[in-house]
């Protein structure tokens, strides 16, 4: 009888094992082992037992011990099971960004590994098992479908193999694939909202705002704003699921014409874009031309208004005749025209919008001086010792300087409150002078002096005022 020990062995691939072949007869004619594996006999005393070292075991094998005894020939097999973990555990590549609501198929491929009966493939999200299946086929493939949710954002998906040799007295061998980090996103089907001026004037700045709601994760959204070839540099502010990108756009004469304004939002592997046209125009303010901005009274003045060739102008509310970019009016300058504003309003149609520009010029009319009875009365009669304010207003442009002197030396304080004394009486020569010339006017001041009359048996003094020309006394009058 031939026996073998051990009858069953589980060993790692490439490993070695000692196999003992024994026979029950004392003097066997023949005792040996049949195997394709490299073998080495270990020398032992006695004839009925032999020990072999089998090495480099790469696959399951069944070496057979045999013996030839007087009573006959017999054999015994040992079962060598080789174990090894898979050489490749891999999740099939997927785009890292996945839209929420999409069915995502996770596919795990496993190459190698034995014994397959003990090999299980597990698909996981984080530590949560999604699917567990025995490894079947070469390569073994396990798939599962996941409905992408918003809360999956940033989740790690992986595939794990479990070679469970615990029933055989060994351990559980695990191999894990490289994780796949899922980036979920929501990019709404609606294009971004773009708010910008439809028309923009050369050498000015405009503000462009691009916004979109319902984004996830909003912080990962990329916003590209451009006007023609000019990339804009927006300031982006974020809400919970929205953003607003605000940029300043400056345009020059080179940009004149119709330009394309684009706002593109890129999130994940998708994008939304809004296009808008902006018309860039040049429209200088109209020019108001006065023959001379400062003229003397009676001068003929031409006021011209000139604007952009395509503009239509009105001058002081009167449209050009015929309607067009030029208007003019003629006038003879009067004092009433001093400070008069001539306003030219020009209107230009740009991309269906009416643009208005104004320019105003003021006319200065030099006139005067004037001194008349209404503003500078020729006669004043005041009671002595009363408080009076001599008033004499000279008119003209420029405003004339006014002096009223008596005897070429004594001033009358115009516009000042004075106590009326006899000194004040007399005729004053008022002279108004400006760069436009001078005028004179005589002003007489009469002082009413009290005269006291005593009645015989009267009840007292009657104060009677009469206009009285006062003699000039040296002691009362004084040069400035």
């Amino acid at each position: 009888q031939t026996s073998v020990s051990p009858s069953k062995v589980i060993l790692p691939r490439g490993g070695s094992v000692l196999v003992t072949c024994s026979t029950s007869c004392d003097q066997p004619k023949l005792l040996g082992i049949e195997t394709p594996l490299p073998k080495k006999e270990l020398l032992l005393p006695g004839n009925n037992r032999k020990v072999y070292e089998l090495s480099n075991v790469q696959e399951d094998s069944q070496p057979m011990c045999y013996s030839n005894c007087p009573d006959g020939q017999s054999t015994a097999k040992t079962f060598l099971t080789v174990y090894w973990t898979p050489e490749r555990v891999e999740l099939a590549p997927l785009p890292s960004w996945q839209p929420v609501g999409k069915n995502l198929t996770l596919r795990c491929q496993v190459e190698g590994g034995a014994p397959r009966a003990n090999l299980t493939v597990v698909l996981l999200r984080g530590e949560k098992e999604l699917k567990r299946e025995p490894a079947v086929g070469e390569p073994a493939e396990v798939t599962t479908t996941v409905l992408v949710r918003r809360d999956h954002h940033g989740a790690n998906f992986s595939c794990r193999t479990e070679l469970d040799l615990r029933p055989q007295g060994l351990e559980l061998f695990e191999n894990t694939s490289a994780p796949y980090q899922l980036q979920t996103f929501v990019l709404p089907a609606t294009p971004p909202q773009l708010v910008s001026p439809r028309v923009l004037e050369v050498d000015t700045q405009g503000t462009v705002v691009c916004s979109l709601d319902g984004l996830f994760p909003v912080s990962e959204a990329q916003v590209h704003l451009a006007l023609g070839d000019q990339r804009l540099n927006p300031t982006v502010t974020y809400g919970n699921d929205s953003f607003s990108a605000k940029a300043s756009v400056s345009v020059t004469a080179e940009d004149e014409g119709t330009q394309r304004l684009t706002c593109a939002v890129i999130l994940g592997n998708q994008s939304q874009e809004t296009l808008q046209t902006v018309t860039i125009y040049s429209f200088p303010a109209p020019n108001v031309i006065l023959t001379k901005p400062e003229v003397s009274e009676g001068t003929e003045v031409t006021v011209k208004c000139e604007a952009h060739p395509r503009a239509k102008v009105t001058l002081n509310g009167v449209p050009a005749q015929p309607l067009g970019p030029r208007a003019q009016l003629l006038l003879k300058a009067t004092p009433e025209d001093n400070g008069r504003s001539f306003s030219c309003s020009a209107t230009l149609e740009v991309a269906g919008q009416l643009i208005h520009k104004n320019q105003t010029r003021e006319l200065r009319v030099l006139y005067g001086p004037r001194l008349d009875e209404r503003d500078c009365p020729g006669n004043w009669t005041w009671p002595e010792n009363s408080q009076q304010t001599p008033m004499c207003q000279a008119w003209g442009n420029p405003l004339p300087e006014l002096k009223c002197l008596k005897d070429g030396t004594f001033p009358l304080p115009i516009g000042e409150s004075v106590t009326v004394t006899r000194d004040l009486e007399g005729t004053y020569l008022c002279r108004a002078r400006s760069t436009q010339g001078e005028v004179t006017r005589k002003v007489t001041v009469n002082v009413l002096s009290p005269r006291y009359e005593g009645g015989s048996g009267g009840s007292g003094l009657n104060d009677i005022f009469e206009a009285q020309k006062i003699e000039w006394h040296e002691e009362n009058l004084y040069f400035q």
Epitope: K403, G408, P411, E416, D423, R433, Y478, Q480
Partner: antibody
């Protein structure tokens, strides 16, 4: 327009001296003319004025000691019984009405009067 | 009586500095006040009239102010050429006046 004084020089105390101011470029019928003096190292001192109407006005201290008169082109200042205290440079000044400046804008160069025995 | 009191009698000021001269009338002369500058051996030069109006050709560094009885002449950014005696003169007709001029202020520039 100008004014110029003449007639200054050495005068004995108690004598009489008349200074003359000759004007050109304006009319005395429309301008008042005055006299101001300045003793050596001292301040300006107003003496008096003759108005455009020929009336005369004097500082309180000058009454009786000075007399101002005029012709069509000259203005005279007569100093009666001068004393050594009357030693000064005498300026003829035009009231500046025409130039709208209240002050003596037009001044003569001055004439020096020395009162000494 | 309309008497003029001028202060100070003399003042020293550095180049670039500011000097203020005051003139007080014994009663209101409204705005009828003039200021003069006189250098040794020269006739007075007219600076300001009507208390605050600057005569033609006078630098804007000279500024007059006041009305009634209190008046001021201010010279800012003083230059060495401003060294002189300055007089105020009341130009309002009145009686019993000893002198139309203030006593003068000598301005020395260091």
């Amino acid at each position: 327009q100008s004014v110029e004084e003449s007639g200054g020089g050495l005068v004995k105390p108690g004598g009489t001296l008349t200074l003359t101011c000759t004007v050109s470029g304006f009319s005395l019928s429309t301008h008042a003319m005055g006299w101001v003096r300045q003793a050596p190292g001292k301040g300006l001192e107003y003496i008096g004025i003759i108005g455009s109407s020929d009336r005369t006005y004097y500082a309180s201290w000058a009454k009786g000691r000075f007399t101002i008169s005029k012709t069509s082109t000259t203005v005279d200042l007569k100093i009666t019984s001068p004393t050594t205290e009357d030693t000064a440079t005498y300026f003829c000044v035009r009231d500046p009405y025409d130039s709208f400046d209240d002050g003596y804008r037009l001044w003569g160069p001055g004439t020096l009067v020395t009162v000494s025995s | 009586a309309y008497d003029m009191t001028q202060t100070p009698a003399s003042v020293e000021v550095a180049v670039g500095g500011t000097v203020t001269i005051k003139c007080q009338a014994s009663q209101s002369i409204y705005s009828y006040l003039s200021w003069y500058q006189q250098k040794p051996g020269q006739r007075p030069k007219f600076l300001i009239y009507d208390a605050s109006k600057v005569a033609s050709g006078v630098p804007s560094r000279f500024k007059g102010s006041g009305s009634g009885t209190e008046f001021t002449l201010t010279i800012s950014a003083v230059q060495s050429d401003d060294a002189a005696t300055y007089y105020c003169q009341q130009a309002y007709s009145s009686s019993n006046v000893d002198n139309a001029f203030g006593g003068g202020t000598e301005v020395m520039v260091k």
